[in-house]
Amino acid sequence: QRLPRMQEDSPLGGGSSGEDDPLGEEDLPSEEDSPREEDPPGEEDLPGEEDLPGEEDLPEVKPKSEEEGSLKLEDLPTVEAPGDPQEPQNNAHRDKEGDDQSHWRYGGDPPWPRVSPACAGRFQSPVDIRPQLAAFCPALRPLELLGFQLPPLPELRLRNNGHSVQLTLPPGLEMALGPGREYRALQLHLHWGAAGRPGSEHTVEGHRFPAEIHVVHLSTAFARVDEALGRPGGLAVLAAFLEEGPEENSAYEQLLSRLEEIAEEGSETQVPGLDISALLPSDFSRYFQYEGSLTTPPCAQGVIWTVFNQTVMLSAKQLHTLSDTLWGPGDSRLQLNFRATQPLNGRVIEASFPAGVDSSPRAAEPVQLNSCLAAGD
């Protein structure tokens, strides 16, 4: 029997609403699926909270290249960081007696492949990125984002789903990985650690960052997520590392300031629309890319991961708010919600820039060890 942690004090709706909710690969649907409904049908079917203005209201494509003060991944020391002293976990889970093996969590039992066999696949995420081994691929052009600068209305749903904090994105946010590789954004969520313990999912030469943002996209070739799961390129995730910096990040504050309203698992609230692109690094031209999986059950493969080379800076207070506000099931804090890095198993991580070329005095003759396989080759 679990004791709810002051459940009465936190309304489900907060102050005013994934990789997270899995679908088994055996559930992949047939071709004749009907389109999903954005909103439940109402009698008068008023516009839902997620409804968006039409195309003519969307801002122009915003390729970013201007420099920011944030650290670049190739600037990191190449010294191997000490391994994490602990496995990622969700602390102090108290589950009901006789809990079956279908409910996954971070750390401990059950092993994820028992929850979803795809989690034992050969091409899983996250991975450790080693820039020196990345294949420079000039065909990887700057990412293009369209419609990511949202007006305050309609409001967006911010939800504590027990695994992360997730912001549901409205229709109309378009992203292109390149010509003919077009996607629409579905949601963003974060992964983090705990006090003094970093919690990014991807690592760089063994270095784990304080936190990581994932913006999850559905290929425009598919009408619904349930059609796209497990299909090559059906989903694409933009990932960026979050680091500590001297100043408050005003874009992130719009979300972090609302976390207390959704402290309990299952609670949600509405937040004004914001510039989603402001949550990402400004340099859309330098990134790493590889094919992997969802980082939570069902761990479906075929996901295109794009990991920005530039990081995003948050203040120490903001990082503390992120890691110390939310609760998972029962009386467990929602912390250390990252999966361990997975083996590449022969995959080559591509880079849109010559990441393997180290301009520091330590590398007299930098060599690119892997060659690029351009998209479509």
């Epitope: 994934g18 899995p22 679908l23 649907p29 279908s102 409910h103 549901t168 949601q187 698992e265 029962g330």
Partner: nanobody, 115 residues
Framework: QVQLVESGGGLVKPGGSLRLSCAAS????????MRWYRRAPGKQRELVAY???????NYADSVKGRFTISRDNAKNSLYLQMNSLRAEDTAVYYC?????????WGRGTLVTVSS
């Protein structure tokens, strides 16, 4: 294909009870958090109750102590037991889940509380 089908709505007097059901297909049901929402005429959609894959539950303040959400993973079914119903509970009730952040909804079942 993910499908959610609600049933159990109807006309009930104040103080009465109803039990709503939601049959799910096309998903590995026992891996999913599930939710009941409602939309009253002329009002915004409201989250009523939540149940995680681990059976952790959470409720809107307006229904705490009166409504109980539950699930039967063997039957791929979600339930909402509604007791001590009030006129303000009148609404269309929707079953909801999401896959990787994309919402899936049933068509709803109408609950009318009136004397």
């Amino acid at each position: 294909q993910v499908q959610l089908v609600e049933s159990g709505g109807g006309l009930v007097k104040p103080g009465g009870s109803l039990r709503l059901s939601c049959a799910a297909s096309g998903i590995t049901f026992n891996l999913h958090a599930m939710r009941w929402y409602r939309r009253a005429p002329g009002k915004q959609r409201e989250l009523v109750a939540y149940i995680s894959a681990r059976d952790w539950t959470n409720y809107a303040d307006s229904v705490k102590g009166r409504f109980t959400i539950s699930r039967d993973n063997a039957k791929n079914s979600l339930y909402l037991q509604m007791n001590s119903l009030r006129a303000e509970d009148t609404a269309v009730y929707y079953c909801n889940t999401d896959l990787v952040g994309e919402d899936y909804w049933g068509r709803g079942t109408l609950v009318t509380v009136s004397s």
